[in-house]
Interface confidence: low
């Protein structure tokens, strides 16, 4: 299969440092099926985003260590990233909902969007934020959010502040932020794209 | 593994300029940015600047008139140009990556150092 | 510019007992996004600074339980619950919230 556990390793290596402690301090009181047992606490806390996907799936099995994973990350309130888990793990299932534009079918990881894959990437390269934000403001951002962002003082804290707002965001909006970053800095996006 | 490793000139003559290179290796410049920090001999640690995976600059305003941070990303170097030098920028100079990769968002390896002495 | 206020200057301690450094900031280092950027660094005498501590209380790969980090706003604390040999050095606080970046002038951990 590999999907699933694909997709729990995009979630989790999308999380901050502090998220993917508080990930593993849930995961060690989170409900469990009946016939499952618990990974141990001194293991898990040691471990990165790729270790803990691996222990994950040769604990729980790929489907309900998605599951599993979705259900921890719903508690700690990032509902979107475990919206976008399930839909990853379900993928092919019926065609996306009206006005909300399907994802790419050549994007590499299947159920997260671009933006949302590079995040790291875009917050360290992106030189040319000024221009996002023109080309954003009005159809994404609020004048408040475009304010917030021009008043950090480095481009990666003007892009960290940015992808702040992107949890509300749907396909449609995340796809605009790409197109802005096509037409600025094509060549980042094609290097992306190539990773 | 991560190294980061300045070179200078050791001395320079006051009013002169000066120019290090911090190469690094084990990790890719378009990825990561790179401070540059220096320490007086006996002192503490001041913040010179940093240049920004994506190639943007920030400097600390107090040395922003005749300071500048370039690089080379296909040569994973980075380089540091001081103007107008004076006995008071005499200091060990260090370069030191900037991790946003890891969420750490701070300095996590530094270089050795390169001792830069301002007499004539 | 944010002042960064170490105390205490130097602190002779016995191998084995506790320590404790403060470092306070002259303006909060809570960033707009939540995160507070304030980190501890470790120079070792005829070395360069090695991360410890970054963004208030998360341990650095390969630091030692033993070191742990506390505070919020503008006051911080870095604690070793039993000082070893090798902690020997200067402890440096510094903040990234504000640009400029800025350091603290050091606490020097030395044998009592």
């Known amino acids: 299969m590999g999907r699933a556990r694909d997709a729990i390793l995009d979630a989790l290596e999308n999380l901050t440092a502090e998220e993917l402690k508080k990930f593993k301090l849930k995961l060690l009181s989170v409900p469990l099926r009946e016939g499952y047992g618990r990974i141990p606490r001194g293991a898990l806390l040691s471990m990165d985003a790729l270790d803990l996907t691996d222990k994950l799936v040769s604990f729980y099995l790929e489907t309900y260590g998605a599951e599993l994973t979705a259900n921890v990350l719903r508690d700690m309130g990032l509902q979107e990233m475990a919206g976008q888990l399930q839909a990853a793990t379900h993928q092919g299932s019926g065609a996306a909902p009206a006005g909300i534009q399907a994802p790419p079918q050549s994007a590499a990881k299947p159920g997260l969007h671009f933006i949302d894959q590079h995040r790291a990437a875009l917050i360290a390269r992106v030189t040319n934020v000024e221009w996002l934000l023109d080309a954003l403001y009005g159809k994404v951002l609020t004048d408040e959010q475009y304010q917030a962002v021009r008043a950090e003082p480095t481009n990666p804290s003007k892009m960290r502040k940015l992808f702040s707002f992107t949890p509300a965001w749907n396909w449609t909006c995340k796809d605009l932020l790409l197109q802005a970053l096509r037409e600025s800095q094509s060549y980042l996006v094609e290097d992306l794209e190539r990773s | 593994q991560v190294q980061l490793k300045e070179s200078g000139p050791g001395l320079v003559a006051p009013s002169q300029s000066l120019s290090i290179t911090c190469t690094v290796s084990?990790?890719?410049?378009?990825?990561?940015?790179v401070h540059w920090v220096r320490q007086p001999p006996g002192k503490g640690l001041e913040w010179l600047g940093v240049?920004?995976?994506?190639?943007?600059?920030n400097y600390n305003s107090a040395l922003m008139s005749r300071l500048s941070i370039s690089k080379d990303n296909s040569k994973s170097q980075v380089f540091l140009k001081m103007n107008s030098l004076q006995t008071a920028d005499t200091a060990m100079y260090y370069c030191?990556?900037?991790?946003?990769?890891?969420?750490?968002?701070?300095?996590?390896?530094w270089g050795q150092g390169t001792s830069v002495t301002v007499s004539s | 510019d944010v002042v960064m206020t170490q105390t205490p200057l130097s602190l002779p301690v016995s191998l084995g007992d506790q320590a404790s450094i403060s470092c306070r900031s002259s303006?909060?280092?809570?960033?707009?996004?939540?995160?507070?950027?304030l980190h501890w660094y470790l120079q070792k005498p005829g070395q360069s600074p090695k991360l410890l501590i970054y963004?208030?209380?998360n341990r650095f790969s390969g630091v030692p339980d033993r070191f742990s980090g506390s505070g919020s706003g503008t006051d911080f604390t870095l604690k070793i619950s039993r000082v070893e040999a090798e902690d020997l050095g200067v402890y440096f606080c510094?903040?990234?919230?504000?640009?400029?970046?800025?350091f603290g002038g050091g606490t020097k951990l030395e044998i009592k």
């Open positions: 303006q909060s280092l809570v960033h707009s996004n939540g995160n507070t950027y």
């Open positions: 084990g990790f890719s410049l378009t990825s990561y940015g």
């Open positions: 510094s903040q990234s919230t504000h640009v400029p970046y800025t």
């Open positions: 963004k208030v209380s």
């Open positions: 030191a990556r900037w991790d946003y990769v890891n969420s750490y968002e701070a300095m996590d390896y």
């Open positions: 240049i920004w995976a994506g190639g943007s600059t």
